[in-house]
């Protein structure tokens, strides 16, 4: 069913994300003690490593395209602060129409 399909997509996206983060860390010279925000998979989408003060924008994830194939992609942002990543804005539920609970069921 669609839930099993979406679960498969999220697992694939997560694996790709971890690879992307590793490559980005190498390119940017990031390590565990570097200032800034480490790349992360937040159970919805992938966030590349960022420097303090940087705002990162991502499109709503692949699952969103399946449910809404004909529409403009929503965009979610996070700021990299001295305290780490900010909350996403807008929240996924309002930007994309679904949230993390659906990806876990």
């Amino acid at each position: 069913g669609s839930m099993a399909h979406s679960d498969g997509i999220f697992k694939k996206e997560q694996a790709m994300c971890l690879e992307k983060i590793q490559r980005a860390n190498e390119l940017m010279g990031f390590n565990d003690s570097s200032p800034g925000c480490p790349g992360m998979w937040d159970n919805i989408t992938c966030w590349k490593p960022a420097h303090v003060g940087e705002m990162v924008l991502v499109s709503c994830p692949e699952l969103f395209r399946i449910f809404n194939p004909d529409q403009d992609m929503g965009v979610v942002s996070r700021n990299c602060t001295e305290d780490g990543w900010s909350e996403p804005f807008p929240h996924y539920f309002d930007a994309c129409g679904f949230d993390e609970y659906e990806s876990e069921t």
Epitope: N68, Q71, D72, G74, V75, F89, P90, H91, D94, A95, G97, F98, D99, Y101, E102, E104, T105
Partner: antibody, heavy 123, light 107 residues
């Protein structure tokens, strides 16, 4: 055809609890595609979104900060309805209260509304 | 919270007129905007969502446009049943917030 039917008292005393119910026909409160919202309207504050509940494998609520400490929205799956409770009311809570269904298509919008209930807070 | 403002607050028009109502958000909201019509003693009725998409069953004389902070609702060839109050509402971030409304009455 989706319909929302509101019920509850129209007069509440200050410091007491305002309780309203919204009965859903033509849809289910447990739908994975909808949200269930409460909104109020008064001359002084205009239209004010109060909160929502929705089911996506588990129940989740979101509330407006202005009422967060006083509000509870509860789904009742056995009757396919949802309720609003607002504690410690004051005359400023006097308003017409509406329930509404939220649906998604590029954004969340409120496509079906209850008939509205005028609630007066007065002793 | 995101503040929504509308102009004008009221306008007088005649049947057959073309009218435009403007809504402005205090910060960019992309196209996460809906328009509603309300008649006295009734609940609001959805007209437009996602800035420009017409709700099913709404006549095509209603149209929406805009993105970011500035939006417009246009009614072409105003009909007698269109005399009402119109509200915009942002849906990018909770709490959802509404404009104060624009009352359209008969000239």
């Amino acid at each position: 055809q989706v319909q929302l039917q509101q019920s509850g008292p129209g007069l509440v005393k200050p410091s007491q609890t305002l309780s309203l119910t919204c009965a859903i026909s033509g849809d289910s409160v447990s739908s994975r595609y909808a949200t269930w919202n409460w909104i109020r309207q008064s001359p002084s504050r205009g239209l004010e979104w109060l909160g929502r509940t929705y089911y996506r494998g588990q129940w989740k609520n979101h509330y407006a900060v202005s009422v967060k400490s006083r509000i509870t929205i509860n789904p009742d799956t056995s009757k396919s309805q949802f309720s609003l409770q607002l504690n410690s009311v004051t005359p400023e809570d006097t308003a017409v209260y509406y329930c509404a269904r939220g649906m998604w298509n590029q954004n969340w919008f409120l496509d079906h509304w209850g008939q509205g209930t005028l609630v007066t807070v007065s002793s | 919270d995101i503040q929504m403002t509308q102009s004008p607050s009221s306008l007088s028009a005649s049947v057959g007129d073309r009218i435009t109502i403007t809504c402005r958000a205090s910060q960019p909201i992309s196209r996460y905007l809906s328009w509603y019509q309300q008649k006295p003693g009734k609940a609001p009725k959805l007209l437009i969502f996602a800035g420009q998409r017409l709700q099913s069953g709404i006549p095509s004389r209603f149209s929406g446009s805009g993105s970011g902070t500035d939006f417009t609702l246009t009614i072409n060839s105003l009909q007698p049943e269109d005399f009402a109050t119109y509200f915009c509402q942002q849906a990018i971030s909770i709490p959802y917030t509404f404009g104060p409304g624009t009352k359209v009455d008969i000239k």
